[in-house]
């Protein structure tokens, strides 16, 4: 008996071939001997089966002695043995219909779990193997689970169902709802305008929800809410914003915040949360602000940074085109009695400059100039 695997919702074509390469009378029946369809004269005729409105044949093939049974919009319960009667012969085809669905929505928040459930006909014992977009393989029986979804899990999951040495492939598009970056650091000199961007790693037609940016300044004992906003069909509207600092927010995606001035008291870490409509849980992105200030007070040239810096970052003070006078893995460096000239304060990571501030030191009889 020939075995054919089908996918729920798809169309399957069961073949039946006569030895004579011409149109002759044929009938398709199910295992209960109920007629599904056949031909009478040149007409396609249908029987009283449940498939009536979903069964068809391909008349253009009858001339060649081929009498297919086409079943559209397959259901699991269409799994059965189908019998083609032609030329006093009976051809049997066993159809097994499988369905593979994601537990809930196919749009899941980062960190959530994905469960794929296999619908299969009674008496079948299929095995399932799924391959994620990042090439991770998972195997299982009726259910497959992946916990802690990551951004790289977004995309097409390819699942193969094996039964009777035959296989059928399902493709499920999964969208992991997350920000493009889990964390970002902005390095700014004191007084500069700060731009925070929170690009999403997915696109959906309608995006609705609400969000908030909580900020923990390095100098502050507790965090505070800097801004709250609503998102409606990708349009951003500010609900509430603090007076200090007075953040500005872009009206369109990606989410964009502007801090008019980088000041030491703002240096610190923020957490932007976005709660999406009809989703449990929130999207998070951490943002860090590092602020640099270079000053000269009497005979002391000082460079300081505020905010979350890693211990391996190097802070240096050097006269332009000269070797660094001072270089330390600390958040403040200084030079006593600095020579006149253009001094550079550099924050670097393995030789790569992250932040630079220049200060001009004048001969001792004048006052310093900060460009």
């Amino acid at each position: 008996k020939k075995v054919v695997l089908g996918k729920k919702g798809d169309t399957v074509e069961l073949t039946c071939t006569a030895s004579q390469k011409k149109s002759i009378q044929f009938h398709w029946k199910n295992s209960n001997q109920i007629k599904i369809l056949g031909n009478q004269g040149s007409f396609l005729t249908k029987g009283p089966s449940k498939l009536n409105d979903r069964a068809d044949s391909r008349r253009s093939l009858w001339d060649q002695g081929n009498f297919p049974l086409i079943i559209k919009n397959l259901k699991i319960e269409d799994s059965d043995t189908y019998i083609c009667e032609v030329e006093d012969q009976k051809e049997e085809v066993q159809l097994l219909v499988f369905g593979l669905t994601a537990n809930s929505d196919t749009h899941l928040l980062q960190g959530q779990s994905l469960t794929l459930t296999l619908e299969s006909p009674p008496g079948s014992s299929p095995s399932v193997q799924c391959r994620s977009p990042r090439g991770k393989n998972i195997q299982g029986g009726k259910t497959l689970s992946v916990s802690q979804l990551e951004l790289q899990d977004s995309g097409t999951w390819t699942c193969t169902v094996l039964q009777n040495q035959k296989k059928v492939e399902f493709k499920i598009d999964i969208v992991v709802l997350a920000f493009q970056k889990a964390s970002s650091i902005v390095y700014k000199k004191e007084g500069e305008q700060v731009e925070f961007s929170f690009p999403l790693a997915f696109t959906v037609e309608k995006l609705t929800g609400s969000g908030e940016l909580w900020w923990q300044a390095e100098r502050a004992s507790s965090s505070k809410s800097w801004i709250t906003f609503d998102l409606k069909n990708k349009e951003v509207s500010v609900k509430r914003v603090t007076q200090d600092p007075k953040l500005q927010m872009g009206k369109k995606l990606p989410l964009h915040l502007t801090l008019p001035q980088a000041l030491p008291q703002y240096a610190g870490s923020g957490n932007l949360t976005l709660a999406l409509e009809a989703k449990t849980g929130k999207l998070h992105q951490e943002v860090n602000l590092v602020v640099m200030r270079a000053t000269q007070l009497q005979k002391n040239l000082t460079c300081e940074v505020w905010g979350p810096t890693s211990p391996k970052l190097m802070l240096s003070l050097k006269l332009e085109n000269k070797e660094a006078k001072v270089s330390k893995r600390e958040k403040a460096v200084w030079v006593l009695n600095p020579e006149a000239g253009m001094w550079q304060c550099l924050l670097s990571d393995s030789g790569q400059v992250l932040l630079e501030s220049n200060i001009k030191v004048l001969p001792t009889w004048s006052t310093p100039v900060q460009p």
Epitope: K22, S23, S42, W62
Partner: antibody, heavy 120, light 107 residues
Framework: EVQLLESGGGLVQPGGSLRLSCAAS????????MSWVRQAPGKGLEWVAF????????YYADSVKGRFTISRDNSKNTLYLQMNSLRAEDTAVYYC?????????????WGQGTTVTVSS | DIQMTQSPSSLSASVGDRVTITCRAS??????LAWYQQKPGKAPKLLIY???NLQSGVPSRFSGSGSGTDFTLTISSLQPEDFATYYC?????????FGGGTKVEIK
């Protein structure tokens, strides 16, 4: 002898109804699909309707769809054509025909025809 | 709908003549074609089915050929009882459609 005999024709006013019958004999009626074909005076042949052997599948010409109904009673070896909302252009000789059981069709047995005249 | 065009619409011939009637379909119908003969006041009679298959009891002087869109009915030697109107009919698609007919008259 294989035979088909139509009856029920006659004169009817536009908008009226008529039911044609076709009595089959000499063959296993319940094993064959059947059709109705008509011929207007001095004109060619026009296929009207088809019914499968079990009466489940029916096809109609666009010109009669929604007005004519083909049916059969296999226990009485009889084919019917219920004609409603008749129009002048339905005036014709109506033939019942047996569909050849070969896979290519063709109507291999025909009745002698019954005349339907639609006129006021 | 598939249109069936027959030619000629009428012809005059003598007993013993070879007569050819053609039928053209507006689209390919493979071999889904039948030919009928109809005499005045009588029901049509099936002559050929599947373009070239002779119906049981029909004299062998009748033959059919063709496939796709062009078909031919040939009467190899016309007999007195063959004077009638001939129709082609496609059964590839519903609605079934007939050609306009070819009337074969005595010359």
């Amino acid at each position: 002898e294989v035979q088909l005999l139509e009856s029920g024709g006659g004169l009817v006013q536009p908008g009226g109804s008529l039911r044609l019958s076709c009595a089959a004999s000499g063959f296993t009626f319940s094993s064959y699909a059947m059709s109705w074909v008509r011929q207007a005076p001095g004109k060619g042949l026009e296929w009207v309707a088809f019914i499968s052997d079990d009466g489940i599948t029916k096809y109609y010409a666009d010109s009669v769809k929604g007005r004519f109904t083909i049916s059969r009673d296999n226990s009485k070896n009889t084919l019917y054509l219920q004609m409603n909302s008749l129009r002048a252009e339905d005036t014709a000789v109506y033939y019942c025909a047996r569909d050849d059981s070969s896979g290519y069709g063709g109507m291999d047995v025909w009745g002698q025809g019954t005349t339907v005249t639609v006129s006021s | 709908d598939i249109q069936m065009t027959q030619s000629p619409s009428s012809l005059s011939a003598s007993v013993g003549d070879r007569v050819t009637i053609t039928c053209r379909a507006s689209q390919s119908i493979n071999r889904w074609l039948a030919w009928y003969q109809q005499k005045p006041g009588k029901a049509p009679k099936l002559l050929i089915y599947s373009a070239s298959n002779l119906q049981s009891g029909v004299p062998s002087r009748f033959s059919g050929s063709g496939s796709g869109t062009d078909f031919t009915l040939t009467i190899s030697s016309l007999q007195p009882e063959d004077f009638a109107t001939y129709y082609c009919q496609q059964s590839y698609n519903t609605p079934l459609t007939f050609g306009g007919g070819t009337k074969v008259e005595i010359k």
